[in-house]
């Protein structure tokens, strides 16, 4: 038995920040689990980890230097990534492991989300032109 994961196909981080919601075919209420977000086609970089425990506060951390936070829903974990760089544009995969109570469950690999990080514009945007010359 595998948990199914749904993610948005693509997200654009205009302000170098993005909310990526991982929706699971499994209710996480009163479970102990480890949800994580991985970067790259080979999922080589573990961007952010959320440990959920029925009796404790959510633990959120990154061992790879990402600025991240996490929010828990009954059947979802939302990762909030900040201070992203343009060169961190990539595909990101949600992963979930439910440890307790047994049995252990993990997910089928999802399709992933392409996060496109737009750089901060140094020149005025066409929608908000600067003061016009007289």
């Amino acid at each position: 038995n595998k948990i199914l994961v749904k993610q948005s196909p693509m997200l654009v981080a205009y302000d170098n920040a993005v909310n990526l919601s991982c929706k699971y075919s499994y209710n996480l209420f009163s479970r102990e689990f480890r949800a994580s977000l991985h970067k790259g086609l080979d999922s080589a970089v573990e961007v952010c980890v959320v440990y959920g425990n029925y009796s404790q506060q959510l633990q959120v951390y990154s061992k790879t230097g990402f600025n991240c936070d996490g929010k828990l829903g009954n059947e979802s974990v939302t990762f909030y990534l900040q201070n992203l760089y343009v060169n961190q544009t990539d595909i990101y995969f949600c992963k979930i492991e439910v440890m307790y109570p047994p049995p252990y469950l993990d997910n089928e690999k999802s399709n992933g989300t392409i996060i496109h990080v737009k750089g901060k514009h140094l020149c005025p945007s066409p929608l908000f032109p600067g003061p016009s010359k007289p």
Epitope: Y54, E97, M99, Y100, P102
Partner: antibody, heavy 120, light 111 residues
Amino acid sequence: EVQLVESGGGLVQPGGSLRLSCAASGFSLSTSGVGVSWIRQAPGKGLEWIGEIYHSGSTYYSPSLKSRVTISRDNSKNTLYLQLNSLRAEDTAVYYCARYGYYYYDFDYWGQGTLVTVSS
Amino acid sequence: DIQLTQSPSSLSASVGDRVTITCRASQSVDFHGISFLHWYQQKPGKAPKLLIYAASSLQSGVPSRFSGSGSGTDFTLTISSLQPEDFATYYCQQSYRSPRTFGQGTKVEIK
């Protein structure tokens, strides 16, 4: 045949560190369906669970030891490791690795254990 | 953490006796109809050996004189006819929640 063999025990100074190994054979540490825990037993006392590692490499630790313990593995050697820091006399124990199945999490195979003595 | 309390802590019995050991959990260890409570036997200088898993299932190779019962918070290990090789210490263990915990043990001695 499934086998677990611990090594690395011995005399350690208080405040020091230990690194124990658990060589697994008869199954792969990286194959889904089984994980391995470390469990210890102080002389004349009961069994205490230290932590575990899943096939994915994810780890879970006892809250009372979490700040001092790291469980890792080397897939190429099919070997599990236990690192315990800031050792004190009460860490003196026989340390076991034990395999568990993913359905019931019962420990179906155990190593023979390795004795760690923390003393100056 | 889930506390497991075994009783008695020790007992003296003779070969052929029926022996019963109980294990009480501080909260239910049941989930979807399964009790995540297991029993182990340990002899001096040896590693523990799994006897019963999921409260009542006999581990492969374990003699049928060993049986387990119970659900929720109250569990029992029974040895129907004690044999010389059964003199040992018995532990219950829960795997319902982390951290996994063990009972303090019950030592079965020769009368």
